[in-house]
């Protein structure tokens, strides 16, 4: 039985050219996290973080994606095309798969703020 819940940074906004942290957190379960996959709005993979093998970042994003903090992902040099949904998929044992959603809006405005409901310092 899957008892865990995923908390995410929810709906966030950030400035074009800036950076943003995508963060998910799995709670209320003792399941072992074996891998976390990060997917973009077109459902393509951005990166994988395996518990033993570490990070594996899709080559096209290597210059703009930084691993962490923790199991999160930092997107850098943001463009308007980065606007959209992002998904964290937690593969766990023995529970199975948990999935979280984040919506990122990239703004031209200099007053864009990166606000989050949840953030790991």
């Amino acid at each position: 039985m899957m008892t865990g819940t995923i908390e995410t940074t929810g709906n966030i906004s950030a400035k074009k050219g800036g950076s943003v942290i995508l963060q998910c957190h799995l709670s209320s379960t003792m399941a072992q996290v074996t891998q976390v996959n990060w997917e973009q709005h077109d459902h393509s993979l951005l990166a994988i973080r395996n518990a033993e093998l570490g990070w594996h970042i899709y080559p096209a994003f290597k210059d703009r994606v930084a691993p962490g903090p923790g199991l999160g992902l930092t997107l850098q040099s943001l463009t308007m095309n980065d606007t959209g949904e992002y998904f964290c998929t937690y593969h766990t044992y023995p529970d199975g798969t948990y999935r979280g959603r984040i919506f990122l809006e990239v703004l031209e405005s200099s007053v864009a703020e990166h606000s989050a409901r949840f953030q790991i310092p």
Epitope: T34, H43, L45, H91
Partner: antibody
Framework: EVQLVESGGGLVQPGGSLRLSCAAS????????MSWVRQAPGKGLELVAT????????NLADSVKGRFTISRDNSKNTLYLQMNSLRAEDTAVYYC???????WGQGTTVTVSS | DIQMTQSPSSLSASVGDRVTITCRAS??????LAWYQQKPGKSPKLLIY???TRQSGVPSRFSGSGSGTDFTLTISSLQPEDVATYYC?????????FGGGTKVEIK
């Protein structure tokens, strides 16, 4: 040049034990997760065990859980696979593999037979 | 666990032929797929990762494509040194699993 050199294979009776070693060179060993992958005679590839760069986290295939242990000594640039309660179906070539499978050793042969 | 199915299990082609090997995943694995070449008596060698990215030093005649559940490894012009068994592997979720292999021979 990245080099992974396995040793410790041999002929062992069912129920016996072996310890495989993999000597790594040509890269910063302590920065990479490592794996053991095996290949039974004439068969395909099976991921047996993986270990974090620091050694703090390991994962074992269901087929070997409770019998095999993966470990590493970063000060010696060496990866290990301790194999206990060996069975005939463990007969295979065992490969030491770096990271996301970008470099493989030459393999060491384990034969379990009475 | 995700099952990986390769086809054909073996093939024979002439030097210079275009060769295509397919790999099918039992569920969506996005582009988390690698291809390996294993020459007789040797250890496997990484050819392609992230479904279509050639590993450094791999000849350009090798290419990978696909996303989701269906993937292809193509050798644009088969060479004698390409005689080997080719394996696909998914790394979308643990445990990482390999296909059964495709043995490529020269006619």
């Amino acid at each position: 040049e990245v080099q992974l050199v396995e040793s410790g294979g041999g002929l062992v009776q069912p129920g016996g034990s072996l310890r495989l070693s993999c000597a790594a060179s040509g890269f910063t060993f302590s920065s990479y997760g490592m794996s053991w992958v095996r290949q039974a005679p004439g068969k395909g590839l099976e991921l047996v065990a993986t270990i974090k760069s620091s050694g703090g986290s390991t994962n074992l295939a269901d087929s070997v859980k409770g019998r095999f242990t993966i470990s590493r000594d970063n000060s010696k640039n060496t990866l290990y696979l301790q194999m206990n309660s060996l069975r005939a179906e463990d007969t295979a070539v065992y490969y030491c593999v770096r990271g996301y499978f970008d470099y493989w050793g030459q393999g060491t042969t384990v034969t379990v037979s009475s | 666990d995700i099952q990986m199915t390769q086809s054909p299990s073996s093939l024979s082609a002439s030097v210079g032929d275009r060769v295509t090997i397919t790999c099918r995943a039992s569920q969506d694995i996005k582009t988390a797929l690698a291809w390996y070449q294993q020459k007789p008596g040797k250890s496997p060698k990484l050819l392609i990762y992230w479904a279509s990215t050639r590993q450094s030093g791999v000849p350009s005649r090798f290419s990978g494509s696909g996303s989701g559940t269906d993937f292809t490894l193509t050798i644009s012009s088969l060479q004698p040194e390409d005689v080997a068994t080719y394996y696909c592997q998914q790394y979308y979720s643990t445990p990482y699993t390999f296909g059964g292999g495709t043995k490529v021979e020269i006619k």
